[in-house]
């Protein structure tokens, strides 16, 4: 009689997580009598997956009824596959004995599990940055298999190129994780911008997963300041306006100082949004000119989003007191537009949080 061969026809089988895997095995002879066992791996540490003779294997069912007369089909079906089931499975014939003796093994079938990546999670910088600065966004996705995966970054639909991606682990594993860090240069117009991390994988059937982050969480747009004087009113009161424009986020505190003394402090709230997502705010201060002998130095001090204060000063000339002056005719604008904190020449006057 021919010598027994154990045939495992497929070198590899790929199955989606959650599905069933069929591992085929046939013997070429009824001789010798003895059971079949399935193992994952080889050597002393191999794992018993199914034994025809004994044991409880709730996820494994023989494809062919083991009691079928002259059965030589020892294929099995493993249900509810997870990435942890990946590995090489061996169909092993035993010769009947006390105990049964291992006789011959099939060549093995490698089971790979196709597992979908988790939804990408995009996280931005811990602290806000201003325009022209570069910030990093990180995208992470886990639990996918096989290892091959494609990740792309977009900003407002435009693909980004400045990013670095790692897939771990480097060696063989039941499942993998991807982590990518993209560098994005901010502009003042980015309050409404969005970065998108897109992950494509064989398990997604051409429908990539996306994770998003809003640049509004990462950006700070410092305000422009402008202080102007309105016409002198009949009651010798001058209306001075501080216009704070194009700032984001809304968190802003404005303080008026008269000759260096705090006159009033206000907090911005419930401001209407500009088209670009920034905010504007206007504050007025009435100065009673007749109450002052000398010129009054007014300072609009703005503290935005916990940053160092920005000042804009304005002098109201008490000596010039015609009743019907036009704007700025009775005052001298001594302030500078101090948007750039580094070049602020009034720094020593600023109040820091």
């Amino acid at each position: 009689e021919e010598e027994l061969q154990v045939i495992q026809p497929e070198k590899s089988v790929s199955v989606a997580a959650g599905e069933s895997a069929t591992l085929n095995c046939t013997a070429t002879s009824l001789i010798p009598v003895g059971p079949i066992q399935w193992f994952r791996g080889v050597g002393p540490g191999r794992e018993l997956i199914y034994s025809q003779k004994e044991g409880h294997f709730p996820r494994v069912t023989p494809v062919s009824d083991p009691t079928k007369r002259n059965n030589m089909d020892f294929s099995i079906r493993i249900s509810n596959i997870t990435p942890a089931d990946a590995g090489t499975y061996y169909c092993v014939k035993f010769r009947k004995g006390s105990p049964d003796v291992e006789l011959k093994s099939g060549a093995g079938t490698e089971l790979s599990v196709r597992a979908k990546p988790s939804a990408p999670v995009v996280s931005g910088p811990a602290v806000r940055a201003t325009a022209e600065h570069t910030v990093s966004f990180t995208c992470e996705s886990h639990g996918f298999s096989p290892r091959d995966i494609t990740l792309k970054w977009f900003k407002n639909g435009n693909e980004l190129s400045d990013f670095q991606t790692n897939v771990d682990p480097a060696g063989k594993s039941v499942s993998y994780s991807i982590r990518s860090t993209a560098r994005v240069v901010l502009t003042r117009r980015d309050v409404h911008s969005q970065v998108i991390c897109e992950v494509a994988h064989v398990t997604l059937q051409g429908d990539p997963l996306r994770g998003t982050a809003n640049l509004s969480e990462a950006i700070r747009v410092p305000p422009f300041l402008e202080v102007t004087q309105q016409s002198m009113r009949a009651d010798n009161q001058v209306n001075v306006t501080c216009q704070v424009t194009k700032f984001y986020p809304q968190r802003l505190q404005l303080t008026w100082l008269e000759n260096g003394n705090v006159s009033r402090t206000e907090m911005a709230s419930a401001l209407p949004e500009n088209k670009d997502g920034t905010y504007n705010w206007t504050s007025w201060l009435l100065v009673n000119v007749s109450a002052h002998r000398d010129d009054v130095k007014l300072t609009c001090q703005v503290e935005h989003d916990g940053q160092p204060a920005v000042n804009k000063s304005f002098s109201v000339k008490v000596s010039a007191h015609p009743k019907e002056q036009g704007s700025n005719t009775a005052a001298e604008n001594t302030g500078t537009n101090e948007r750039d904190y580094k070049d602020d020449d009034d720094k020593h006057h600023h109040h820091h949080h």
């Epitope: 009598v33 003895g34 034994s51 044991g55 009691t67 059965n71 009947k96």
Partner: antibody
Framework: QVQLQQPGTELVRPGASVKLSCKAS????????INWVKQRPGQGLEWIAM????????HYNQIFKDKATLTVDKSSNTAYMQLSSLTSGDSAVYYC????????????WGRGTSVTVSS | DIVLTQSPASLAVSLGQRATISCRAS??????????IFWYQQKPGQPPKLLIY???NLDSGVPARFSGSGSGTDFTLNIHPVEEEDAATYYC????????FGGGTKLEIK
């Protein structure tokens, strides 16, 4: 190791019935056929029937079709053979045997139950 | 049904000699290249023990002095050299269809 346990003796009255048991251990009960064989004192072996414990499929020797009924209890890994309308001709040793190769052979045997039909 | 006829019904063989037992089937018990004949040994007060399966294959733990041969309808069990412990009754069984046993051959050791 494979074991098939059978009670040693059964004494029954003519016309009565007896239910013989065969408790299996050391293997997956539902994966192998159980055969029943009769041997009268000083005589040869007679195959009675076989049962597949997984689904209770049975095959009978036509001679014993009206005499023997095979059943299994999967929860206790036990095979049963009920013999009805007993006569002195049913006095014999009854063996259960397990078919390990699905070849309709008898690889492992119980020690047998001696049934005596006597008034 | 396939009828198996064993011969002789009994035989006595000297220690160390060859014992040959024949089993003839009323029709072929071969199928798909296999010969569905099995041989059993039974000693008094014990259940039968499988010796040979599919005509020529020694079961686990059976001494090599036992051998089986034959095909189609004619099969033979050989024991050589016979030992004292081989005194027993030997049965052939087929499984080409539902099983049946031969009538048995009683072997005595001289």
């Amino acid at each position: 190791q494979v074991q098939l346990q059978q009670p040693g003796t059964e004494l029954v009255r003519p016309g009565a019935s007896v239910k013989l048991s065969c408790k299996a251990s050391g293997y997956t009960f539902t994966n192998y056929w159980i055969n029943w064989v009769k041997q009268r004192p000083g005589q040869g072996l007679e195959w009675i029937a076989m049962i597949d414990p997984s689904d209770s499929e049975t095959h009978y020797n036509q001679i014993f079709k009206d005499k023997a009924t095979l059943t299994v209890d999967k929860s206790s890994n036990t095979a049963y053979m009920q013999l009805s309308s007993l006569t002195s001709g049913d006095s014999a040793v009854y063996y259960c045997a397990m078919d390990y190769g699905s070849l309709y052979a008898m690889d492992y045997w119980g020690r047998g139950t001696s049934v005596t039909v006597s008034s | 049904d396939i009828v198996l006829t064993q011969s002789p019904a009994s035989l006595a063989v000297s220690l160390g000699q060859r014992a040959t037992i024949s089993c003839r089937a009323s029709k072929s018990v071969s199928s798909s290249g296999y010969n569905y004949i099995f041989w059993y040994q039974q000693k008094p007060g014990q259940p039968p023990k499988l010796l040979i399966y599919l005509a020529s294959n020694l079961d686990s733990g059976v001494p090599a002095r036992f051998s089986g041969s034959g095909s189609g309808t004619d099969f033979t069990l050989n024991i050589h050299p016979v030992e004292e412990e081989d005194a027993a009754t030997y049965y052939c069984q087929h499984s080409r269809e539902l099983p049946t046993f031969g009538g048995g051959t009683k072997l005595e050791i001289k």
